[in-house]
Interface confidence: medium
Amino acid sequence: AGTPPGKAFNLTWISTDFKTILEWQPKPTNYTYTVQISDRSRNWKYKCTGTTDTECDLTDEIVKDVNWTYEARVLSYPAGNVESTGSAGEPLYENSPEFTPYLETNLGQPTIQSFEQVGTKVNVTVEDERTLVRRNNTFLSLRDVFGKDLIYTLYYWKSSSSGKKTAKTNTNEFLIDVDKGENYCFSVQAVIPSRTVNRKSTDSPVECMGQEKGEFRE
């Protein structure tokens, strides 16, 4: 209640591994939306001009500096006239919450790249997800961006039982002890312990020994 017709509300940042979209409501009726995002010079940059959608991909802007705290706003204009303004000479607009990508982007579901058994040891490798953050024209991996802030937790258990064990690493590899002759299943989770929000990813798909990803050597 109390929101003027045409004014956006519920502005929400949806961000995973730095892919970042601003969403809002409602669907437009007789108006269009334009998004502005504040750059590092505190200038407002126009994005998604004259859109009838209720989301705007701001990834290209936020990856320029993932440690910066960004603000965005959604402007509403009468349909077919992006120059129209409200009674105070300004378009209706609503500000987003602040968003700091490094601290707030969700950690995407990790993937177990491979596991290799050598005797009673298993080496489990987590895929180093590529992000949309660039440096020197190269896309950085999650590990490149977060460094040792990012750890992985491995959950592993015998296929024949449900009792889980855990291991942690601040690289992308685990080396764990297993019982000879037993098959094990694995799942990993990405964690940034220093965060206060969005600390953990969802668990990876479960991979079990005896499947294609594994390798066994005496």
């Epitope: 209640a1 979209i21 409501q25 007789n30």
Partner: antibody, heavy 124, light 108 residues
Framework: QVQLQQWGAGLLKPSETLSLTCAVY????????WSWIRQPPGKGLEWIGE???????RYNPSLKSRVTISVDTSKNQFSLKLSSVTAADTAVYYC??????????????????WGKGTTVTVSS | EIVLTQSPGTLSLSPGERATLSCRAS???????LAWYQQKPGQAPRLLIY???SRANGIPDRFSGSGSGTDFTLTISRLEPEDFAVYYC?????????FGGGTKVEIK
């Protein structure tokens, strides 16, 4: 004449994942939103969520943690997955086209094409 | 969440009579988002009215919609035997999109 044909498993056990697909015949995914709606036995309609042809999604907050809607433009179809089902998820599930209809100066939104519905029962 | 409350729950009328169905919203709804659907047993809902007032393709002119803000009405000027069904209002602009609880129009 656009038609929606839907299919998927009709009987599930608690904790399993419901999976339904809806194929669009006689028209394109592009330019529309595509919704899933459900109706428990003897009750009213509940909107589950929607997806655009670009893959952008909106979900009902009451189900958001369990719902995934995806789109396959190459097959002209979209899908619903609902994880960790319970008996409360027993319902007829409908897919529908959510149309943004442009008129001079603005848009209307409504669901003008519906699938026939798939009955999903969750029982141990 | 915008809650849509439909009344009455059941309307018992005879063919040829006029039916007036009410849909009240918990918050103001832009009429562009407001639609009415008809559902018969074992069938999917069918769009009747969109934009609060506009009849969908193939819908007879005995169906009409009116209202604005928080109060909307579906009127069936003269009930035909095939009109006995459940009617739902819906708003499709603000997530979560919501339906009213339905009004059953039954033969008296």
């Amino acid at each position: 004449q656009v038609q929606l044909q839907q299919w998927g498993a009709g009987l599930l056990k608690p904790s399993e994942t419901l999976s339904l697909t809806c194929a669009v015949y006689g028209g394109s995914l592009s330019g529309y939103y595509w919704s899933w709606i459900r109706q428990p036995p003897g009750k009213g309609l509940e909107w589950i969520g929607e997806i655009g042809a670009s893959g952008s999604t909106r979900y009902n907050p009451s189900l958001k943690s369990r719902v995934t809607i995806s789109v396959d433009t190459s097959k002209n179809q979209f899908s619903l997955k609902l994880s960790s089902v319970t008996a409360a998820d027993t319902a007829v599930y409908y897919c529908a086209r959510d149309t943004p209809y442009y008129y001079e100066g603005g848009y209307y939104y409504y669901m003008d094409v519906w699938g026939k519905g798939t009955t999903v029962t969750v029982s141990s | 969440e915008i809650v849509l409350t439909q009344s009455p729950g059941t309307l018992s009328l005879s063919p040829g009579e006029r039916a007036t169905l009410s849909c009240r919203a918990s918050d103001s709804v832009d009429s562009s988002y407001l639609a009415w659907y008809q559902q018969k047993p074992g069938q999917a809902p069918r769009l009747l009215i969109y934009g609060a007032f506009s009849r969908a393709n193939g819908i007879p002119d005995r169906f009409s919609g009116s209202g604005s803000g928080t109060d909307f009405t579906l009127t069936i000027s003269r009930l035909e035997p095939e009109d006995f069904a459940v009617y739902y209002c819906q708003q499709a602009g603000v997530v979560p999109y919501t339906f009213g609880g339905g009004t059953k129009v039954e033969i008296k």
